[in-house]
Each structure stands twice: as structure tokens, then as C-alpha cells.
């Protein structure tokens, strides 16, 4: 058993049929010594008396809010949550496996630049009695500070018969050094509590590996005289790190016909313009990637050829 | 650098960008194969990192690029030695057309632009990284290449910025 926060405790249980459970001793936070009784949740049934209460925690029915009283007055509370371990593996019932970029990916994180700011998100099908708490640091043995906000519900989607909820959180490294080569990864820890079930999820990454620039901005076409060619130009996204002579991007320009089956023409360039042939009903798209490190491409910015 | 000494920024930029390409072709991103899960603290913590105080940021380069270039030079020698060591030359053998050979040569090429011509660096340190089993060697290769990708990315940014803003 360990303390998650004040008066909230997590009991770690090996979860299998007829498991013996864990013996837990609760102590009433009071100077009183006599006339103390204990109850669980809203029940008025007295579970025991005295300053301490010893219970055997085996299942969710044994978890909940234990309260000690004296003469009708509440003295203190202890909330017990369960953390299940099945076959040596902690349960992951609350969050959905996003399976990207690999199986058992529950947290996904992205950064728009090298400033030390990043966003993580996760999915669940649970809609109520759900709380999340997020902590982060750079490195684990001698951790350096990363400040995370509160997790918020950021999207709701219907997937077949059930609803899926996306939560996200923004974090910022306290003393970010955008130009340095990271040697210690960022660690993100999410505590999830659904009713009386506790689970924790972690992710470890370098900012450089989760970079995904915003799409190029101000995408424009300029027809070239007496030619089917056009000059496409664009700019670095506002959110990208500066100066651009240091934090450089590379770009992919694509000409795509109306039909998905049509052959795509692609050009790669480090410049912020390119000359391409504009076909009727086609569209021109441009995306960006860090020039020197192969992290994710941005989403496409597109304009129609017409 | 004081005394009017600056590297051939454009040459260095071209070579370092080539190094980035080669480092990724030598070890493409295999579904974000997370090598940190393999407990590599002791193996790749020993490689040089371009750290915050090394002056490799745009302001540091403007003030005095010497310490940054020194750090890059040391890193290039270190990785060149690693790629020439039995970690890469031992079993399992690299494919004949492996980009590691080109990568090794390019590391040497870039380091030569930053040092007197004809240095043959020797070291006692690299063997301490050498694994005994072929599978360990394979894993270590991946880890070294992943570290190298991060290192040369910073070096390439430095030289690109230098070529754009510090060239005479």
C-alpha cells in the first residue's frame, strides 16, 4: 500500500481467483483514543472500533472511503483504491491501446518545435467517475523539472456503437535547451482513477522523436507565363523554432489529381518554393519535416490548381 | 572563432547534411523501435553529447563558435572510432552495400575539415563498449546509430546556421 495523495491510498493486488489479498491497517488521524468506530462509504454498518482498523483487501468491494467517527462526528477519511496485477502485469483497463506507433501505446505525445513544450493525449471509452493526474520530468535518476497542466477532455468521437473520449495535457520543460542534443528522455506519468480502480501509464521519449511541425503557411500559386507550370511558394509555420537558418525544415510538394488512383507527383526541396505542373482539377499540397532529423511529417497544406 | 579562424562553413554544411542522410539510411526508423527499453544507459551514456553549455545555440555560435566546434570535432572522432571498431566490423557482418562504410568515411571527411591534415587518432576507450555476443553487438549498433542521428542533426544545424550567418 502507498499514498497517492493526502488520505488516498493505493493497494496493489495480485489478481487471480482465490488470491489472499493484502492486509491493510488503517489509523484514524486523531488524538482521541477511545470510542472510535469505522464505516465504509455511505453504509452505517460499523466495521470495527478503536484507533486502528485491520482489513483484508481482496476485491473492489473492500475498497472505498473508510471513515472513523466518534459520537456522530467524523474524525478522518482514508480512500482505498485498487491497482490490479494479473500474471505479473499491471492492468490497463481504463485507457485504450492506440497501437501507434506500436502495440501497448496508451499515451501519445507530439511537439510542434524544440521549445520543450509538448502535448500528450490518450483515449478511453469511460465517460464518468474518471480522473487523471499527470507528472513529468527530464530523466528519472536526477529528474529535471517539467510542468504539466491539468488533463482536459479534448474530443469525443463515435466509434461504431460506443463513444470514445480523448483527453490531452500540455507540458513545458522548465529549463529547455532547444539547441542541445538530448541525452536524457522526458518521462511522462499519468495516474488514472476510475471509480475505485487505479492505473498508471508512462511514456518515455526525446522531444526530437515526437516533433511534428505544423503545416506550412501561406501556400500560394503563381502561374508561369506561356506554361502549364506554376510556382508554388509557402512559408515556415509560425510555431516552428527560430532562427530558421538553424532550425531548418525540408518540404515535400505533391500534385494530386481528383481521383485517388491518379499518380501523385512528388518533389522534395529545402527551399520555400518549387515549380510544378498543375493539372486540371488537381490540388497541390505541401508538408514539412525537420531537415536533419527524421521525425514526423506535418499534415498537408493544400490549394486547388484552378 | 577568434583570430579570423572559421571553418569552411559551406563545405561543413554539405558534409554534415550528407551525414544526416547516411545516418538515417544506415538505421531507418523501424516503427520507432524503442531502444531505450533495452536498458542502454550504460552503453550509450558514454558517447559525446552536444550539451546546453557547449555554445552550439545560435547566440553561442555568434559569440564564439570555438567551444561548439571543439565538441563537434571530438564527437566526430568518437563516432568514427566506434564505426571502425569491432562493434561494426565483427559478426554479424554488415552487408557489402551497407551505408555504414560511407557513414564512417563521411565522419572522417568532416572531422578532417576541423583538424590538421594527417591526424590518426588512437584511443584506449572504445573497447570498453565492445560486447561479446553477436546479438549484443547488433543491438549496440542500433543504439550507436540512433545516438549518432541525434548528434549529427545538431552538428548539421550548427554548420547550416554558420554557412548562412557566419561565413565571411
Amino acid at each position: 500500500i502507498w499514498e497517492l495523495k493526502k488520505d488516498v491510498y493505493v493497494v496493489e493486488l495480485d489478481w487471480y481467483p482465490d488470491a489472499p489479498g493484502e492486509m491493510v491497517v488503517l489509523t484514524c488521524d486523531t488524538p482521541e483514543e477511545d470510542g472510535i468506530t469505522w464505516t465504509l462509504d455511505q453504509s452505517s454498518e460499523v466495521l470495527g472500533s478503536g484507533k486502528t482498523l485491520t482489513i483484508q483487501v481482496k476485491e473492489f468491494g473492500d475498497a472505498g472511503q473508510y471513515t472513523c467517527h466518534k459520537g456522530g462526528e467524523v474524525l478522518s477519511h482514508s480512500l482505498l483504491l485498487l491497482h490490479k496485477k494479473e500474471d505479473g502485469i499491471w492492468s490497463t483497463d481504463i485507457l485504450k491501446d492506440q497501437k501507434e506507433p506500436k502495440n501497448k501505446t496508451f499515451l501519445r505525445c507530439e511537439a510542434k518545435n524544440y521549445s520543450g513544450r509538448f502535448t500528450c493525449w490518450w483515449l478511453t471509452t469511460i465517460s464518468t467517475d474518471l480522473t487523471f493526474s499527470v507528472k513529468s520530468s527530464r530523466g528519472s535518476s536526477d529528474p529535471q523539472g517539467v510542468t504539466c497542466g491539468a488533463a482536459t477532455l479534448s474530443a469525443e468521437r463515435v466509434r461504431g456503437d460506443n463513444k470514445e473520449y480523448e483527453y490531452s495535457v500540455e507540458c513545458q520543460e522548465d529549463s529547455a535547451c532547444p539547441a542541445a542534443e538530448e541525452s536524457l528522455p522526458i518521462e511522462v506519468m499519468v495516474d488514472a482513477v476510475h471509480k475505485l480502480k487505479y492505473e498508471n501509464y508512462t511514456s518515455s521519449f526525446f522531444i526530437r522523436d515526437i516533433i511534428k511541425p505544423d503545416p506550412p503557411k501561406n501556400l500560394q500559386l503563381k502561374p508561369l507565363k506561356n506554361s502549364r507550370q506554376v510556382e508554388v511558394s509557402w512559408e515556415y509555420p509560425d510555431t516552428w523554432s527560430t532562427p530558421h537558418s538553424y532550425f531548418s525544415l525540408t518540404f515535400c510538394v505533391q500534385v494530386q489529381g481528383k481521383s485517388k488512383r491518379e499518380k501523385k507527383d512528388r518533389v522534395f526541396t529545402d527551399k520555400t518554393s518549387a515549380t510544378v505542373i498543375c493539372r486540371k482539377n488537381a490540388s497541390i499540397s505541401v508538408r514539412a519535416q525537420d531537415r536533419y532529423y527524421s521525425s514526423s511529417w506535418s499534415e498537408w497544406a493544400s490549394v486547388p490548381c484552378s | 572563432v577568434p583570430g579570423g579562424s572559421s571553418p569552411a562553413w559551406t563545405q561543413c554544411q554539405q558534409l554534415s547534411q550528407k551525414l544526416c542522410t547516411l545516418a538515417w539510411s544506415a538505421h531507418p526508423l523501424v516503427g520507432h523501435m524503442d531502444l531505450r527499453e533495452e536498458g542502454d544507459e550504460e552503453t550509450t551514456n558514454d558517447v559525446p553529447h552536444i550539451q546546453c553549455g557547449d555554445g552550439c545555440d545560435p547566440q553561442g555560435l555568434r559569440d564564439n563558435s570555438q567551444f561548439c566546434l571543439q565538441r563537434i570535432h571530438q564527437g566526430l572522432i568518437f563516432y568514427e572510432k566506434l564505426l571502425g571498431s569491432d562493434i561494426f566490423t565483427g559478426e554479424p557482418s554488415l552487408l557489402p552495400d551497407s551505408p555504414v562504410g560511407q557513414l564512417h568515411a563521411s565522419l572522417l571527411g568532416l572531422s578532417q575539415l576541423l583538424q590538421p591534415e594527417g591526424h590518426h587518432w588512437e584511443t584506449q576507450q572504445i573497447p570498453s563498449l565492445s560486447p561479446s555476443q553477436p546479438w549484443q553487438r547488433l543491438l549496440l549498433r542500433f543504439k550507436i546509430l540512433r545516438s549518432l542521428q541525434a548528434f549529427v542533426a545538431v552538428a548539421a544545424r550548427v554548420f547550416a546556421h554558420g554557412a548562412a550567418t557566419l561565413s565571411p
Epitope: - | V1, S5, S6, P7, A8, F78, L113, P116, E117, W121
Partner: antibody, heavy 120, light 112 residues
Framework: EFQLQQSGPELVKPGASVKISCKAS????????MNWVKQSKGKSLEWIGV????????SYNQNFKGKATLTVDQSSSTAHMQLNSVTSEDSAVYYC?????????????WGTGTTVTVSS | DVVMTQTPLSLPVSLGDQASISCRSS???????????LHWYLQKPGQSPKLLIY???NRFSGVPDRFSGSGSGTDFTLKISRVEAEDLGVYFC?????????FGGGTKLEIN
């Protein structure tokens, strides 16, 4: 002020080895490479080799390969040079010299010099 | 190895005179990075050498402006515009473009 304080004079028997030291002060030891230079009596200077202190990388003049071994002790900011199997040809003053840094490669801070005399 | 040839071997001068020392290398000292690594050192009697001029023409800190260096490729010159008593000693040219670094044989500047 930058200083390189070298160990005192050495009288060595032919065939023996001798290790001389050079303690750096006034600057960050690992930021600059350390060179060693030989000056025989009434003669010019010969570059022996160089060591990069934070990784122990060494590069030698081929004429001194096997003769000289360069090492550093980062914790005490001290560079060492060992001369092996000495002969009368090795009698000389040996200097440790800091180089000016990357892309400068001049020898800007010279040690006090250590006189090695080989005699039976 | 690059051979550095210094002339003259000995240079007698009167105080206040101009002195000129020549240094020639057996191959070009222009590095592939475009810089030329030719330096001049002065060794006074009983002392360690000291750096005077680096990279052909740059005076090292604290070196008086009566010292100047010039040259390119394989031919280099050190000039002292007005010799003072404290300038006496042996002058060495040296190259660090190629490994091993090499030094000239030295030129002894002495009073006439």
C-alpha cells in the same frame, strides 16, 4: 593566469622508462588539447604528439610512436608523457604545450620544461 | 613530413634596426578549410618558447605591434620594425596545417 607546471629534472638509465607530468591551472583542462614538444641541446623543436583530454584520443608523430605514450588524469588536470626504453638520443628538454583550440592549432601556453638526462 | 627552412641562421642587428626572418615550407600550408597555419615563436635564453604570431599575420595577445608576419603558400616572413633588447633570442617558424607539426631550425637574433 594560464599555467603549465611540469615535474622536475630526471636522470634515467638507458633502457629504463620515465614518466613526466604537467599540471594545468587557470583554464578548463578538458577544453584544450595538450601537445608535447622535444628540444634537444642546441637543437630545434620536434612535435611529439597531442592528446584530447576528455576522451584520451591521441595522435603521434610517427618518429615517436612506441617511444612516447601520452595520458591524462582529468581529476587532477594533469597530463603525462611516458618515454619508454630510453637512449642517449632521448636526452632533451620536454615541454607540454596547450594548443589554442579548434581551427587555431597554435601552441599558446608552454610548460616550464622538464630536462631528461639519459646516462648510465 | 613538411620541412621548414629558416634563413638566416643568425641575424646580427643593431638596436632600433629593422629585422627580417624568412621561412619556407616544402609544401603549401593552405589547409583544405582555406586557412594557413604558419606561426612564429620566440625563445629567450633559459626560457620556454612563446607564441608571437599565429596564422601568418595575427599578433598574439600582448605582442607589440613592431612584430608583423606576412606571406602565403610556402613563403613567409617575420619582420621586427625596430629591434629592442628584449627581442633577442631564437625565432622559430612552425606549421600546423599538416601532422606532424614541424618547426624551422631557428634564427638567432643577436646584437651586432
Amino acid at each position: 593566469e594560464f599555467q603549465l607546471q611540469q615535474s622536475g629534472p630526471e636522470l634515467v638509465k638507458p633502457g629504463a622508462s620515465v614518466k613526466i607530468s604537467c599540471k594545468a591551472s587557470g583554464y578548463s583542462f578538458t577544453d584544450y588539447n595538450m601537445n608535447w614538444v622535444k628540444q634537444s641541446k642546441g637543437k630545434s623543436l620536434e612535435w611529439i604528439g597531442v592528446i584530447i583530454p576528455n576522451y584520451g584520443f591521441t595522435s603521434y608523430n610517427q618518429n615517436f610512436k612506441g617511444k612516447a605514450t601520452l595520458t591524462v588524469d582529468q581529476s587532477s588536470s594533469t597530463a603525462h608523457m611516458q618515454l619508454n626504453s630510453v637512449t642517449s638520443e632521448d636526452s632533451a628538454v620536454y615541454y607540454c604545450v596547450r594548443d589554442g583550440g579548434i581551427l587555431l592549432w597554435y601552441l599558446d601556453v608552454w610548460g616550464t620544461g622538464t630536462t631528461v638526462t639519459v646516462s648510465s | 613530413d613538411v620541412v621548414m627552412t629558416q634563413t638566416p641562421l643568425s641575424l646580427p642587428v643593431s638596436l632600433g634596426d629593422q629585422a627580417s626572418i624568412s621561412c619556407r615550407s616544402s609544401q603549401s600550408l593552405v589547409h583544405s578549410n582555406g586557412n594557413t597555419y604558419l606561426h612564429w615563436y620566440l625563445q629567450k635564453p633559459g626560457q620556454s618558447p612563446k607564441l608571437l604570431i599565429y596564422k601568418v599575420s595575427n599578433r598574439f595577445s600582448g605582442v607589440p605591434d613592431r612584430f608583423s608576419g606576412s606571406g602565403s603558400g610556402t613563403d613567409f616572413t617575420l619582420k621586427i620594425s625596430r629591434v629592442e633588447a628584449e627581442d633577442l633570442g631564437v625565432y622559430f617558424c612552425s606549421q600546423s596545417t599538416h601532422v606532424p607539426y614541424t618547426f624551422g631550425g631557428g634564427t638567432k637574433l643577436e646584437i651586432n
